[in-house]
């Protein structure tokens, strides 16, 4: 957690953020781990650290290695760990696995691919983008801020994505590049009438007296983004938040999953403490969508404690 | 010097309300993370409730999670916790205290605690 | 919620003798881990932080180990003034105690 891997390439800019955060007033130390040797503040020296950043303009391959961080507050000394390498400049164009980035995913709605570790460098528009190694050109490719937009994305713009642009440190400039691989989705989603996995209709839950008891509301609505869809508990037909009961209370926000590819979402009640007249009341599991609102029904029974004979 | 001073503890009946204050001092309240901590008569601690410095946001253990409400007010350096619909498992002592380094998203340590306040739920 | 289990629950010792207490969490916590001490009527106190760092003020006798799921606390030579409850707490994600370990004199 408090140990990040950087990379870089020889002979560009390479800027590493201590991975154990402060606050903005705390002061920061950089030591090489290896030897336990501070690194420099001053900016006239080719690795430099900078409050939070470590910066290496241009970066070595003998650079690599592990560098540790001691974030300090008036009473409180923190430690980080940044495990830097850099690699030799590849002749060709294949990027290896070891220089990419996190994978991102696209779709026709939604083809953003933003330039990986750029927001620690001090850089100005536009990007530079290639794909598999050609500069991208036409007019369905915008370079916008930090991101690249592709308008109209189909499956063969999937591939490996490099940004590249120039850092400016005190008037020298420095270039960089970042790869990272880009994913189309086919979005083919639909919208059905609400589909409730739990409970059953007519469920009876057993539950124990004084314990606490889960009630889960399960529910699919098609495939893809849904753009209403909802399940939600009442009880005795009255929202929960109406009821009054405050041992009785939905988790906050609602769980979304996709199963087999579908949007699901579902709803927990927790009843707390339960009590005998939570027995005679009605539990309401309900699911809607644009296409129409779906109930499933629970009642709860004791359940009878099992004797334990000797 | 760092000082937390809890009040407004007491004795209320199961299904009451009530509001605890913190009064902080010796240091700047606004840019500390604080923390309600609660320890029931001769159990262990048990964390209630977060709330950010100035932004604000708020964290809650889930036994308090929709009955209890905590708050600040920056320009008083004042913390509150409002506790409805306490039951009898809300007795405890309440301590308030601060974390000297929370970074939006993470937690930390309690470096200075108040001596707390007593709350007795019972009818 | 990540669970702290302490043991033992009770450690009986004489002054001058080491106190080894343990922290086990269920599941990692990295070192975002730290141990208080508190006395009868009195405020828990901070210790160690970061699994291993003694806070401010804290004599050098208190020392802390371990990483992920496994935790020590150290005291190397009991002073009297060291009877109490000791409490780790993890905030790896959000913050739990652990029950607490009472070292109480033999």
């Known amino acids: 957690k408090f140990s990040k891997q950087s990379w870089g390439l020889e002979n560009e800019a390479l800027i590493v953020r201590c991975p154990r955060q402060g606050k903005p007033s705390y002061t920061v130390d950089w030591y090489y781990s290896q030897t336990n040797k501070s690194i420099p503040t001053q900016e006239r020296n080719r690795v430099f650290a900078s409050g939070q950043l470590l910066k290496f303009l241009p970066a070595a391959v003998a650079d690599s290695g592990i560098y540790t961080c001691i974030v300090r507050s008036p009473t409180f000394n923190r430690t980080g760990y940044a495990n830097v390498t850099i690699y030799k400049k590849q002749s060709d164009c294949n990027v290896p696995d070891y220089l990419m980035y996190s994978t991102v995913s696209g779709s026709e709605k939604n083809s953003k691919i933003y330039c990986p570790t750029i927001d620690l460098y001090n850089w100005t528009a536009p990007l530079e983008w290639f794909k598999n190694c050609q500069a991208l050109q036409g007019s369905r490719y915008r370079a916008h801020k930090s991101f690249l937009v592709i308008d109209n994305v189909m499956t063969e713009d999937a591939g490996d994505y490099t940004c590249k642009f120039i850092h400016n440190e005190n008037g020298a400039n420095y270039s960089v590049t970042a790869t990272r691989s880009f994913t189309v989705k086919d979005e083919q989603g639909f919208s059905l009438f609400p589909v409730i996995g739990a409970p059953a209709q007519n469920e009876i839950k057993e539950v124990e007296i004084g314990k606490n008891a889960n009630l889960t509301c399960s529910a699919c609505f098609g495939k893809g983004t849904q753009f209403l869809a909802a399940v939600l508990w009442q009880l005795n037909g009255t929202k929960i938040t109406d009821f009054g009961e405050p041992r009785i209370q939905q988790e906050e926000g609602q769980n979304q999953s996709f199963s087999n590819g579908l949007a699901c979402l579902d709803m927990v009640l927790r009843i707390a403490d339960v009590k005998e007249e939570d027995l005679l009341l009605q539990y309401d599991c309900l699911a809607l969508n644009l296409h129409g609102l779906r109930r499933h029904t629970v009642r709860l029974s004791r359940k009878n404690p099992i004797d334990h004979h000797s | 010097e760092v000082q937390l001073l809890e009040s407004g503890g007491g004795l209320v009946q199961p299904g009451g309300s009530l509001r605890l204050s913190c009064a902080a001092s010796g240091f700047t309240f606004s840019v500390y993370d604080m923390i309600w901590v609660r320890q029931a008569p001769g159990k262990g601690l048990e964390w209630v409730s977060t709330?950010?410095?100035?932004?604000?946001?708020?964290y809650y253990a889930d036994s308090v999670k929709g009955r209890f409400t905590i708050s600040r007010d920056n320009s008083k350096n004042t913390l509150y916790l409002q506790m409805n619909s306490l039951r009898a498992e809300d007795t405890a002592v309440y301590y308030c205290?601060?974390?000297?380094?929370?970074?939006?998203?993470?937690?930390?340590?309690?470096?200075?605690w108040g001596q707390g306040t007593l709350v007795t739920v019972s009818s | 919620e990540i669970v702290l289990t302490q043991s033992p629950a009770t450690l009986s010792l004489s002054p001058g003798e080491r106190a080894t207490l343990s922290c086990r969490a269920s599941q990692s916590v990295d070192d975002d881990l730290a141990w208080y001490q508190q006395k009868p009527g009195q405020a828990p106190r901070l210790l160690i932080y970061d699994a291993s760092n003694r806070a401010t003020g804290i004599p050098a006798r208190f020392s802390g180990s371990g990483s992920g799921t496994d935790f020590t606390l150290t005291i190397s030579s009991l002073e009297p003034e060291d009877f109490a409850v000791y409490y780790c707490?993890?905030?790896?994600?959000?913050?739990?105690f652990g029950q607490g370990t009472k070292v109480e004199i033999k």
């Open positions: 709330i950010r410095g100035e932004g604000g946001g708020t």
């Open positions: 205290a601060r974390d000297p380094w929370s970074t939006e998203g993470s937690f930390f340590v309690l470096d200075y």
């Open positions: 707490q993890q905030y790896n994600d959000a913050i739990t």
